[in-house]
């Protein structure tokens, strides 16, 4: 069971990143699915290595003082959402914006029907060029 | 099937990074090989988690305006090269240069004879000190 | 065999990061253990994908000229410590400090009784907020 999906620019104002089965994507079988373009949902309980990569372009003067944060989050049936992993990068002083890449990854127990998704502080700063931003998992 | 190889400084002007089976490297068996010191080639079709880490030292004034980009690329028999993953980091203002580390990783389907390699925008900026720059894969 | 542990702030002055089985941690069975809150120790020989993520907040003026370095290290029974992976990030010019995240990961052969741990140049700069700093492994 494995998946690798590709970032998709979105007009939605939500902080949850959007993904698509396009380009060189992976969706090994129907035991993992991409739902609503925003979350990977698994049908089998078990340990999964889950990862995300986010490339963004931001400028210190044009952004809030808070850093750019990417969060890998979990929603299990009947449970609250919870943060699994986060990464933070202070905005660049480069103009018009400076690019930076974040990589998140870790091993987590998922229940049947659990979904994982990626949140960012400012989706408009995310880079969607080939290979820059992706999201995936593999069952151990 | 798994491999982990170590960066090697090269006098070649190519943007493709060079690697060696030295230090604490891994080459599990002959189903994965390091070819010409530049690409990992697999004999078996399947899903692989492929990763690379690149540490580099650069300075904004001494570099082009474009960021430092590391790309994980795929060459399958009879197919064009394609980019699997990229990461970008704007150059540092630190002098003489500022170090930054990039990590790339994802799950991809590889065909028999497929090769993966790592490209960077400026190989002269890559750090080859122990553990700083490496490349590997594992078959799921 | 898999583990994922969560960073813990420590009053110790050691450069070795401290970890805990808390929050959304993973400890699959007793073939991997967290020892003294500082190292993951495996009982079985084999290939492991080992990873660490470290988020830190530092300022160029308040720090040494050297970058922030995170090292993934190995101690095998009867052998000296050795470095598996390192990442380096130059300190930010942001005030009071600028956050940055480092991700390390690779495939390594571990012997029975081998321990892996994470060293940083300045533990006081490490961020321990939810999900920011973690450490884990999985047996292939």
């Amino acid at each position: 069971i494995a998946a690798h999906v590709i970032s998709e620019a979105s007009s939605k104002t939500t902080s949850v990143l959007q993904w698509a089965e396009k380009g060189y994507y992976t969706m090994s079988n129907n035991l993992v699915t991409l739902e609503n373009g925003k979350q990977l949902t698994v049908k089998r309980q078990g340990l999964y290595y889950i990862y995300a990569q986010v490339t963004f372009c931001s400028n210190r003067e044009a952004s809030s003082q808070a850093p750019f944060i990417a969060s890998l989050c979990l929603k299990s049936p009947g449970r609250f959402e919870r943060i699994l992993l986060r990464a933070a990068n202070t905005h660049s002083s480069a103009k018009p914006c400076g690019q930076q890449s974040i990589h998140l990854g870790g091993v987590f127990e998922l229940q049947p029907g659990a979904s994982v998704f990626v949140n960012v502080t400012d989706p408009s700063q995310v880079s969607h060029g080939t290979g820059f931003t992706s999201f995936g998992l593999l069952k151990l | 099937i798994a491999a982990h190889v170590i960066s090697e400084a090269s006098s070649k002007t190519t943007s493709v990074l060079q690697w060696a089976e030295k230090g604490y490297y891994t080459m599990s068996n002959n189903l994965v090989t390091l070819e010409n010191g530049k690409q990992l080639t697999v004999k078996r079709q399947g899903l692989y988690y492929i990763y690379a880490q690149v540490t580099f030292c650069s300075n904004r004034e001494a570099s082009s305006q474009a960021p430092f980009i590391a790309s994980l690329c795929l060459k399958s028999p009879g197919r064009f090269e394609r980019i699997l993953l990229r990461a970008a980091n704007t150059h540092s203002s630190a002098k003489p240069c500022g170090q930054q580390s990039i990590h790339l990783g994802g799950v991809f389907e590889l065909q028999p004879g497929a090769s993966v390699f790592v490209n960077v925008t400026d190989p002269s900026q890559v750090s080859h000190g122990t553990g700083f720059t490496s490349f590997g894969l594992l078959k799921l | 065999i898999a583990a994922h542990v969560i960073s813990e702030a420590s009053s110790k002055t050691t450069s070795v990061l401290q970890w805990a089985e808390k929050g959304y941690y993973t400890m699959s069975n007793n073939l991997v253990t967290l020892e003294n809150g500082k190292q993951l120790t495996v009982k079985r020989q084999g290939l492991y994908y080992i990873y660490a993520q470290v988020t830190f907040c530092s300022n160029r003026e308040a720090s040494s000229q050297a970058p922030f370095i995170a090292s993934l290290c190995l101690k095998s029974p009867g052998r000296f410590e050795r470095i598996l992976l390192r990442a380096a990030n130059t300190h930010s010019s942001a005030k009071p400090c600028g956050q940055q995240s480092i991700h390390l990961g690779g495939v390594f052969e571990l012997q029975p009784g081998a321990s892996v741990f994470v060293n940083v140049t300045d533990p006081s700069q490490v961020s321990h907020g939810t999900g920011f700093t973690s450490f884990g492994l999985l047996k292939l």
Epitope: - | I6, G129 | P67, I83
Partner: nanobody, 117 residues
């Protein structure tokens, strides 16, 4: 061409001290971690100590811990090994090397340290 030139060896009594130096040229010294290794008469190479590019992180073999100190001066492209409380078993040819013991691609011609009364 990469060159590593060790100096500072000699004859010293047990309990005495020596400071070894290694002058590096032909590569960007600050871009590499460095090691000291030694070879006792009739024995194999033994790793002694390691230092990172900036002198922030160091490692020592158990046999020398607390007695030897590795350091570097990047402005002078020089690596040092301060050896205190020397013992007869420290007698060896000492080499400096680029990177770690498993990875060294270059090392010098060595300097002989003899500890004897």
């Amino acid at each position: 061409e990469v060159q590593l030139l060790e100096s500072g060896g000699g004859l010293v009594q047990p309990g005495g001290s020596l400071r070894l130096s290694c002058a590096a040229s032909g590569f960007t010294f600050i871009a590499y971690d460095m090691s000291w290794v030694r070879q006792a008469p009739g024995k194999g190479l033994e790793w002694v100590s390691w230092i990172d590019e900036w002198g922030l992180q160091t490692y020592y073999a158990d046999s020398v811990k607390g007695r030897f100190t590795i350091s570097r001066d990047n402005s002078k492209n020089t690596l040092y090994l301060q050896m205190n409380s020397l013992r007869a078993e420290d007698t060896a040819v000492y080499y400096c090397a680029k990177k770690t013991p498993e990875e060294f691609d270059y090392w010098g011609q060595g300097t002989l340290v003899t500890v004897s009364s």
